[in-house]
Interface confidence: low
C-alpha cells in the first residue's frame, strides 16, 4: 500500500527519544527494511543503528528485570537467615549469660577456677554453629576429659594426682561416669540440635548464594535477538500500541532461561530439605530447648559429680591404687552445695514458631521460582495482551500466535521457534549451582537423621544417594582421630581459619 | 593491579615449624578465597591449603593434613601459613594464589575446595627443609 | 591427581589441544614458562579468560574432559600448562604438567 510509505515515524520517535538515543538517528517517514538484521524487513522506522541500539536495550532490559526478580527473593532468604541465625546465636548467649550469672554462687571455685574451660565450650560450640571444621562429640567429649582431671584435683586438694594417675582416672571415667547421665544426653541432643540449625541457616545461605550467582549469568546473542523482537521490533515496523501474544513471550523467555530452569528440580529438593529440618527444631531434643539450656546439662553434671564424689573416688584408687598424700594440701574439700537447677525445658518464647511458620510459607511461595520466571517477567515486565486474541504481536505482525509453548529447562527447548538454543552446551555457572544446590541437600537429609556429613563414621557402609562431590569442609575425607583424654592440651584447639583470639572470645 | 608477595621462606631445619606470609593488594582482600599452592623442584604445583573469605572453610592437600593451618586477617590483607613438623619434602617455591571471583554471600566456602577457579599468583617464596 | 599428557607439540601458527581428566566440574589451566617462576592462568572456571591473556587461549569441556585450545600457536606459548580441579573428597589438585614444545 503506497499510502504506507510516508507513515510517519513519530511513536518510534518518541521511544527511541525516551530511552535516551539520539532522534536524529529516526528517519522523519518509513524507509525500506532491507537492511534489517532481526526485525522483519517490512518498510520500517528503524536504521541499522537503531535496530542494534534497540537490541542491546532490550537485552539490558531483560538482565535488569531478571536481577530484580532475583534480589527480591535473595533479600528474603538473607532475612530469614539474618532471623534465624540472630535467634540461634540469641539461645547460645541466653544460656552463657545464665551460667555466668548463676555458676559462681551454686559452685563456688569449682566453676570460677574452670570459668575459662566453660568460655572455650561456649566458643567452640559457637564456632561449630557457624560451620568451623570440628567435630562436636570430640569437642565435648574433650571438655568433659578436661574438666574431670580439674575438678577431681579441687576436690581432693589433699592429694598428690600426677599426669600418669590423670591419665589412668581419663581411661576409667567412661565406666566410671562421673558426670551421670549429662553428657551422654548433651552428646546425643547437642549434636542433633546444632546439626539442624546449622544446616538450616547454611542451607538459606547456599539458596542465597545460588540466586546470586545464577543473576549475573549473561543472557546470550540468540536471546539478545529474540527480545528485541519480542520488544522493539512491533515499533519498527509501525504497529503501534501491539502488545506481545502471551504464548509468544513465554517462548522467548522460556527459551532465553533455559538453563536456569534446569535449577528447578535440585532447587525444589533443597527448599524440601529446609522446610522438612524445622521440624527438629521443637521437642526436647529440639534447637530451642537443646541450644537455650547447655547450661542446665553442666549444672547437672557437676551436681552428679559432687553427689557421687566418694563412689567415684573410691572406685578410681581401686583401678589406679592409692595416690601419694600430698603434705602441703589442705584437708579435702568440703561437700558443695548443690548447684540449682534451672528447669531444663525452655518454655518456647513463640519466637521461633513465628520465624518457622514465616519461612515455611515464605519457601514455599518461592518454590516454582525457576520455572515460574518466564510467566512472572511476561505479565509483569512486557504488559502482554490479554488475551490470545489476533491483535497481539506475534514477532512478525499483528495476528494470532500459532506454536505450541515450549516446555521448562534446556532439553525442552531443541523446537523453540524463538530463540536457537544449542541443548548440547549447558551454561558452566548454572551446572556448578545445580551441584551446590544438590551437596547442601545431602547435608541437610544428613542432618535430618541426626548426622553430620562432614563426619560420617567411617565404617558406613557407604550405601545410599549422595551428590558425588557433596562435601563443603575439609574434614568429609578425614574423620578426627579422638584425642586420648589423657593429652593435657588446653581446651581450646587451634581451629583451622581462626585466629586465636577468635577462638576464644566470647559474645 | 593485584599483588602477591609472599615472604618467610628461607633455609628451614627438619622437625621446626615454618611461618609464610603473604601480602596482598589491589583488590578488595575481605571478598576473595585464596590459596596456598607449592612446587617441589622439578616437579608439579600441589595444592597446599585453602581459606574462604570468611577465614572458616580451611581444606587441606593430603601431605600437609595435620600438620598445616591457613588463617587470614582482613584487617591486615595478609593469609598465613603455618607448617610444623618439617620434612625435607616440604622444600620448594610456595605461592599464593587467589580466588577469581569475588564473594559477598554469607556462606561461600566451597571456593576454598578447588583449584579450577584462580586468577592471580604471588611470585613465590623458596623454601629449603635441610 | 589430574591426567593430562607429558607433553605435545604444536607447529607455529598452528592448533594445539591439551587434554585434562579426573576432576570435578569444573577446570583451571595455569601456564609455567620455567620452573620455579610464578604460574599465570589462562583459563579458569574451564571457560573464563582473564582480560590479560590473548584470545588466542581457549578452554572447553566435555563430560569429564577439560581442553585448553591455543590457536595459533607463538614460540612464547612454550610453557608447561598446569590443569587444576577438585577431587572425590572435594580438595583441590593439580595435574602432573603438560610441555608444549612449539
Known amino acids: 500500500d503506497p499510502a504506507s510509505k510516508s507513515r510517519s515515524c513519530g511513536e518510534v520517535r518518541q521511544i527511541y527519544g525516551a530511552k535516551g538515543f539520539s532522534l536524529s538517528d529516526v528517519p522523519q517517514a518509513e524507509i525500506s527494511g532491507e537492511h534489517l538484521r532481526i526485525c522483519p524487513q517490512g518498510y520500517t522506522c528503524c536504521t541499522s543503528e537503531m535496530e542494534e541500539n534497540l537490541a542491546n536495550r532490550s537485552h539490558a532490559e531483560l538482565e535488569t528485570a531478571l536481577r530484580d526478580s532475583s534480589r527480591v527473593l535473595q533479600a528474603m532468604l538473607a532475612t530469614q537467615l539474618r532471623s534465624f541465625d540472630d535467634h540461634f546465636q540469641h539461645l547460645l548467649n541466653d544460656s552463657e549469660r545464665t551460667l555466668q550469672a548463676t555458676f559462681p554462687g551454686a559452685f563456688g571455685e569449682l566453676y570460677t577456677q574452670n570459668a575459662r574451660a566453660f568460655r572455650d565450650l561456649y566458643s567452640e560450640l559457637r564456632l561449630y554453629y557457624r560451620g568451623a571444621n570440628l567435630h562436636l562429640e570430640e569437642t565435648l567429649a574433650e571438655f568433659w576429659a578436661r574438666l574431670l582431671e580439674r575438678l577431681f584435683k579441687q576436690l581432693h586438694p589433699q592429694l598428690l594426682l600426677p599426669d600418669d594417675y590423670l591419665d589412668c582416672l581419663g581411661k576409667q571415667a567412661e565406666a566410671l561416669r562421673p558426670f551421670g547421665e549429662a553428657p551422654r544426653e548433651l552428646r546425643l541432643r547437642a549434636t542433633r540440635a546444632f546439626v539442624a540449625a546449622r544446616s538450616f541457616v547454611q542451607g538459606l545461605g547456599v539458596a542465597s548464594d545460588v540466586v546470586r550467582k545464577v543473576a549475573q549469568v549473561p543472557l546470550g546473542p540468540e536471546c539478545s535477538r529474540a527480545v528485541m523482537k519480542l520488544v522493539y521490533c512491533a515499533h519498527c515496523l509501525g504497529v503501534p500500541g501491539a502488545r506481545p501474544c502471551p504464548d509468544y513471550c513465554r517462548n522467548v523467555l522460556k527459551g532465553c532461561l533455559a538453563n536456569q530452569a534446569d535449577l528447578d528440580a535440585e532447587w525444589r529438593n533443597l527448599l524440601d530439605s529446609m522446610v522438612l529440618i524445622t521440624d527438629k527444631f521443637w521437642g526436647t531434643s529440639g534447637v530451642e530447648s537443646v541450644i537455650g539450656s547447655v547450661h542446665t546439662w553442666l549444672a547437672e553434671a557437676i551436681n552428679a559429680l559432687q553427689d557421687n564424689r566418694d563412689t567415684l573416688t573410691a572406685k578410681v584408687i581401686q583401678g589406679c591404687g592409692n595416690p601419694k598424700v600430698n603434705p602441703q594440701g589442705p584437708g579435702p574439700e568440703e561437700k558443695r552445695r548443690r548447684g540449682k537447677l534451672a528447669p531444663r525445658e525452655r518454655p518456647p518464647s513463640g519466637t521461633l514458631e513465628k520465624l518457622v511458620s514465616e519461612a515455611k510459607a515464605q519457601l514455599r511461595d518461592v518454590q516454582d521460582f525457576w520455572i515460574s520466571l518466564p510467566g512472572t517477567l511476561c505479565s509483569e515486565k512486557m504488559a502482554l495482551s490479554t488475551a490470545s486474541d489476533d491483535r497481539c504481536w506475534n514477532g512478525m505482525a499483528r495476528g494470532r500466535y500459532l506454536p505450541e509453548v515450549m516446555g521448562d529447562g534446556l532439553a525442552n527447548q531443541i523446537n523453540n521457534p524463538e530463540v536457537e538454543v544449542d541443548i548440547t552446551k549447558p551454561d558452566m555457572t548454572i551446572r556448578q549451582q545445580i551441584m551446590q544446590l544438590k551437596i547442601m541437600t545431602n547435608r541437610l537429609r544428613s542432618a535430618y537423621n541426626g548426622n553430620d556429613v562432614d563426619f560420617q563414621d567411617a565404617s558406613d557402609d557407604g550405601s545410599g544417594s549422595g551428590s558425588g562431590d557433596g562435601c563443603l569442609d575439609d574434614l568429609c575425607s578425614r574423620k578426627v582421630s579422638r584425642k586420648s583424654s589423657s593429652s593435657r592440651t588446653p581446651l581450646t584447639h587451634a581451629l583451622p581459619g581462626l585466629s586465636e583470639q577468635e577462638g576464644q572470645k566470647t559474645s | 593491579a593485584v599483588t602477591l608477595d609472599e615472604s618467610g621462606g628461607g633455609l628451614q631445619t627438619p622437625g621446626r615449624a615454618l611461618s609464610l606470609v603473604c601480602k596482598a593488594s589491589g583488590f578488595t582482600f575481605s571478598s576473595y578465597t585464596m590459596f596456598w599452592v607449592r612446587q617441589a623442584p622439578g616437579k608439579g604445583l600441589e595444592f597446599v591449603a585453602g581459606i574462604d573469605n570468611t577465614g572458616i572453610y580451611t581444606p587441606y592437600g593430603s601431605a600437609v593434613k595435620g600438620r598445616a593451618t591457613i588463617s587470614r586477617d582482613n584487617g591486615q590483607s595478609t593469609v598465613r601459613l603455618q607448617l610444623n613438623n618439617l620434612r625435607a619434602e616440604d622444600t620448594g617455591t610456595y605461592y599464593c594464589?587467589?580466588?577469581?571471583?569475588?564473594?559477598?554471600?554469607?556462606?561461600?566456602?566451597?571456593?576454598?575446595?578447588?583449584?579450577?577457579?584462580?586468577?592471580?599468583w604471588g611470585h613465590g617464596t623458596e623454601v629449603i627443609v635441610s | 591427581a589430574l591426567t593430562q599428557p607429558a607433553s605435545v607439540s604444536a607447529n607455529l601458527g598452528g592448533t594445539v589441544e591439551i587434554t585434562c581428566s579426573g576432576g570435578g566440574n569444573d577446570y583451571g589451566w595455569y601456564q609455567q614458562k620455567s620452573p620455579g617462576s610464578a604460574p599465570v592462568t589462562v583459563i579458569?572456571?574451564?571457560?573464563n579468560r582473564p582480560s590479560n591473556i590473548p584470545s588466542r587461549f581457549s578452554g572447553s569441556t566435555s563430560g569429564s574432559t577439560a581442553t585448553l585450545t591455543i590457536t595459533g600457536v607463538q614460540a612464547d606459548d612454550e610453557a608447561v600448562y598446569f590443569c587444576?580441579?577438585?577431587?572425590?573428597?572435594?580438595?583441590?589438585?593439580f595435574g602432573a604438567g603438560t610441555t608444549l614444545t612449539v
Open positions: 579458569y572456571d574451564s571457560i
Open positions: 587444576g580441579s577438585y577431587d572425590s573428597s572435594y580438595v583441590g589438585i
Open positions: 594464589a587467589k580466588y577469581a571471583d569475588a564473594c559477598t554471600g554469607p556462606w561461600c566456602g566451597s571456593s576454598a575446595y578447588t583449584a579450577s577457579t584462580i586468577d592471580a
